[in-house]
Interface confidence: low
């Protein structure tokens, strides 16, 4: 019989219900925005905004300072007071819409939903390793701002994204705001604008450049700005918006908008559609070719990538890549395929595609019928003409006007659908050693830290743990402070180490010591931990073998048994070849001689499942007693593997030595032609791995084997005669003298 060790699912080597407690701060209200600051003199801070309040925390998440930012019109509003005696506008709560650092000063800038979306500048004052905010400056000049032209009206109550860029001695705020007709009519925030902060901190310079959704489209065409970032020579905004100005406004897609970070101009404003799909390896019938589209971006982050992922993306290590989590629709509800997918867009390729799109629009000969696009911002036109103009005049350039690139950038889910039901709500990507890790927050308040790699059919987890007991969604914005990431969920801010919260979720020594080097995991006798958790017994050097099962569970006291041991950390080499003398197996007092691997039985084991098998021949010693005993595997002097060496002993109970007894055989005669069905009765007849009934030295073909009975069909006899009949178990004869009589047919 060919018994095989049962597969152990890969998931059995880890436990994601292990509780980790990470430092946290209760903000007293739903966290609306969060940003971190690290100074060059070891001072650092976390700024956390809730409705009507701004908290300043130290690097240990302890409160350092708190500032009232609302309600507007309330005498206790500390930021409002910076604008002089009021009233400055209708009273109401202040929801923080923008919280950014101006690195040039350095200063914190906060903008809220009240007071026409104006901003406040808070200079940073280092005090030891903590930071305090100086008295706020009101970035609003009453005489410069009118309802139809308001350079100091920055934040939209519907959402605003800001990236601050230093150009020369000035700070430029790249601002993108969601608008509707009501918001647009009230102090005219713009969709996209570049505003220079005035040197005297009295507001923003008038005459700024901007693009806005045209009034006729404001009702039906809304743009959500999901993320903004600055890398290289450009600032990028990521949007979710209707795919068409004219068609169904609920048919959404994702775009990347690119603006120059070196020139405060919008002539080279470019948009590119980002297309993220789930393309399963085996396509279901009826599934769309090219994969199932996930058109709606939920969260994004750009980061340089490690060597391994860079190779897979065919780019150089350290190059910047935009990662996005996409869903099928606004509700992100379930459909066929996973709830969330992650796509990677190398920035170099984004830029190249955009540049090619400009060439297609502006280089002769231009493809006929190619539209400039962005009809929600500007008058429709065909390339190479500027918006609304019939043709180029000699002193205008095709390249100096906004453009939607005619081709989209298509990518497939890096995780191959393996996120399954998980709804990702936050994303931050870091490079650790040569590994790229996605730190993801989820709808149910968990943190998943997963290696970003596309070639596998399972997820490589650094960790997967619950942030707290509330189960509230993790919010979109994540900040980094040193070696920690700050996630917000409900009214709490949590500080999560980028190396993972610990190692206790790895349940086996092998999984523990195979963990990434940056996690600092070691084995502590019976658990996985970091050195500070068990300094006495902590080691990263070796793992004992681990026996999980063996077969058979019993064997004859006389005769041999082929024993198959199952478990892990037997070999460390897929071939299962073991050097001479490294593996000792004993069953009770008796040695079990290692057998060479039968190469015909070697099966590739997918890493999703793991099991190792070891076979040995058990020949009991004369002193071995009948009854239950232990199986023991000791491994010594093994050469080290990639992660550790195998060294130690594993013991498993449950093997029994038995003495087979033959009590009766019938019938005792049959035809010379053979084929008589013999029944042998006794005890312990099924022990071990081999048995044979011999009639005159020829095997009687076994039809059934049980503990108390064997059935076999007699072989043909040479002559009519009485011949010896014997039973061998494990190659040794069972005591007793029996004969079988061949008679004429």
């Amino acid at each position: 019989e060919d018994w095989q060790c049962p597969r152990t699912p890969y998931a059995a080597s880890r436990d994601f219900d292990v509780k980790y407690v990470v430092p946290s701060f209760s903000a007293g209200g739903l966290v609306q925005a969060m940003v971190t600051y690290e100074g060059d003199r070891n001072e650092s801070a976390v700024f956390v905004a809730i409705r009507n309040r701004l908290h300043v925390l130290g690097p240990d998440l302890k409160s350092v300072q708190s500032l009232a930012t609302g309600p507007a019109g309330d005498p206790g509003c500390q930021t409002c007071a910076a604008c002089g005696p009021g009233p400055h506008g209708p009273p109401g709560d202040t929801d923080t819409k923008v919280l950014v650092l101006d690195p040039a000063l350095p200063a914190l800038v906060s903008c809220g939903s009240s007071l026409q979306g104006r901003c406040f500048l808070h200079d940073l004052e280092p005090q030891g390793t903590a930071v305090h905010l100086a008295a706020p400056a009101c970035l609003f000049s009453a005489h410069h701002n009118r309802p139809d032209d308001c350079p100091d009206c920055v934040a939209s109550p519907l959402g605003t994204r800001v990236t601050v860029v230093e150009q020369g001695q000035a700070s430029y705020f790249y601002v993108a705001s969601s608008l509707d007709a009501a918001v647009a009519a009230s102090f005219s925030p713009r969709s996209v604008s570049i505003r220079r902060l005035k040197a005297d901190a009295s507001g923003f310079a008038p005459g700024f450049v901007a693009l806005s959704v045209l009034p006729k489209h404001l009702v039906s065409y809304s743009i959500e700005y999901v993320h903004s970032f600055h890398t290289g020579a450009f600032v990028y905004f990521l949007t979710v918006q209707p795919a068409s100005v004219t068609d169904d406004p609920s048919a959404l897609h994702t775009r990347l908008a690119r603006l120059s970070a070196t020139e405060p101009e919008l002539g080279d404003y470019r948009e590119l559609v980002l297309d993220c799909r789930f393309a399963p390896k085996r396509r279901r019938r009826g599934a769309p070719e090219g994969g199932q589209p996930y058109p709606v971006l939920r969260v994004a982050h750009s980061a340089p990538v490690g060597a391994q992922l860079a190779t897979e993306l065919s780019i150089a290590e350290g190059q910047e890549v935009l990662f996005g989590v996409f869903v099928t629709g606004k509700d992100g509800g379930p459909g066929v395929g996973p709830n969330s997918v992650v796509c990677a867009f190398p920035i170099d390729l984004l830029d190249t595609l955009i540049d090619e799109g400009v060439e297609r629009c502006c280089e002769s000969p231009v493809h006929p019928g190619l539209r400039r696009g962005l009809d929600f911002f500007q008058s429709p036109s065909f390339c190479p003409n500027p918006p609304g103009l019939e043709a180029l005049s000699p002193n205008t350039s095709c390249r100096h006007f906004p453009l939607l690139v005619s081709s989209s950038f298509s990518r497939v889910d890096l995780f191959n659908g393996l996120l399954g039901p998980v709804q990702v709500t936050a994303l931050y990507v870091t490079r650790l050693d040569n590994v790229t890790v996605a730190h993801m927050g989820t709808m149910d308040g968990r943190i998943l830290q997963v290696e970003l790699v596309r070639s596998l059919n399972y997820l490589l987890y650094v960790s997967n743990f619950s942030l707290g007991d509330s189960g509230q969604p993790v919010q979109r914005d994540v900040s980094r402070l040193g070696d920690h990431l700050l996630f917000a969920s409900g009214d709490q801010v949590f500080q999560v180490p980028i190396q993972g919260p610990g190692c206790r979720h790895f349940l086996t020594c092998g999984r523990c010591l195979r963990a990434w080097h940056f996690m600092g995991c070691g084995w502590c006798g019976n658990m996985c931990g970091q050195q500070k958790e068990c300094p006495g017994s902590w080691q990263q050097d070796h793992c004992p073998p681990k026996l999980t099962e063996f077969h058979p569970h019993s064997g004859p006291l006389r005769g041999s048994t082929r024993l198959t041991l199952c478990g892990s950390n037997f070999y460390l080499h897929p071939s299962g070849l073991v050097p001479e003398g490294t593996h000792q197996v004993t069953v009770g007092q008796s040695p079990c001689r290692p057998l060479p691997k039968d190469s015909s039985k070697l099966r590739p084991v997918p890493r999703k499942d793991f099991v190792e098998e070891f076979e040995c021949e058990l020949e009991p010693l004369g002193t071995q007693a009948v009854g239950p005993t232990n199986v023991s595997l000791t491994v010594t002097n093994m050469p080290p593997g990639k992660h550790f060496r195998v060294d130690g002993t594993s013991v498993l109970r449950g093997f029994s030595f038995m003495e087979p007894v033959l009590i009766a055989v019938q019938p005792l005669f049959g035809p010379r032609a053979g084929g008589t069905c013999l029944t042998l009765e006794g005890q312990s007849l099924s022990v071990g791995t081999s048995r044979a009934v011999l009639v005159n030295g020829t095997e009687c073909l076994l039809a059934r084997v049980s503990e108390g009975q064997l059935l076999c069909a007699t072989p043909p006899g040479a002559t009519v005669a009485s011949v010896p009949l014997s039973l061998q178990v494990g190659g040794a004869q069972v005591p007793g003298s029996w004969t079988f009589q061949y008679r004429e047919d």
Epitope: S406, S407, S410
Partner: antibody, heavy 123, light 112 residues
């Protein structure tokens, strides 16, 4: 596997037009690549003639001036070369090839080539 | 147009010996994105050209690792560590940084 196959007349008279077809199997000409024509003159000199990209935009070698164009038929997964006013100087083996991905559709050179078709221009 | 100059035009080799071909461009092939679009192709007798190397040094799948490419800017080299019979044919360099794309005149690798 991607395969390209050129077809067209082997003999063309001077001043006439040369039309060649490239039939692509194993890939769609609307996928993210550029589809090129390259020719090889007697004596082995290779000349890149131009491409049509997956989106239908084209780019031509200026040396061919205005007498060269590339078009396509996406339903048949074919793209075409038309060279007007041919002379004996246009006698060559004509290859179609799949170009690169992203950067100008050419960057990584030509990974897949047809087997080539010999065209002779002669009265 | 960028002129690609290959040397030597003919290279006589012994099987098992190394071989080296040089290609020089009339202007730098470094593109603004930091990549250098220099390719090497081999045309065996009676066959169409086949790409061996792209982006200066990246080997196409199925190309033996006895082939290697190196260089930057305007000077590039193709090396074969040990020539085998199947390596005989004409080698071309191709630049695809600048339009129009241009080929070298070719180097014929033949048996001594």
């Amino acid at each position: 596997d991607v395969q390209l196959q050129e077809s067209g007349p082997g003999l063309v008279k001077p001043s006439q037009s040369l039309s060649l077809t490239c039939t692509v199997t194993g890939d769609s000409i609307t996928s993210d690549y550029a589809w090129n024509w390259i020719r090889q003159f007697p004596g082995n000199k290779l000349e890149w003639m131009g491409y049509i990209s997956y989106s239908g935009s084209t780019s031509y070698n200026p040396s061919l001036k205005s007498r060269f164009s590339i078009t396509r038929d996406t339903s048949k997964n074919q793209f075409f070369l038309q060279l007007n006013s041919v002379t004996t100087e246009d006698s060559a083996t004509y290859y179609c090839a799949r170009g690169g991905f992203y950067y100008r559709y050419a960057g990584p050179g030509f990974a897949y080539w047809g087997q080539g078709t010999l065209v002779t221009v002669s009265a | 147009d960028v002129v690609m100059t290959q040397t030597p035009l003919t290279l006589s080799v012994t099987i098992g010996q190394p071989a080296s071909i040089s290609c020089k461009s009339s202007q730098s092939l470094l593109y603004t994105n930091g990549k250098t679009y220099l390719n090497w192709l081999l045309q065996r007798p009676g066959q169409s050209p086949k790409r061996l190397i792209y982006l200066v040094s990246k080997l196409d799948s199925g190309v033996p690792d006895r082939f290697s490419g190196s260089g930057s800017g305007t000077d590039f080299t193709l090396k074969i560590s040990r020539v085998e019979a199947e390596d005989l044919g004409v080698y071309y360099c191709l630049q695809s940084t600048h339009f129009p794309l241009t080929f070298g005149a070719g180097t014929k690798l033949e048996l001594k």
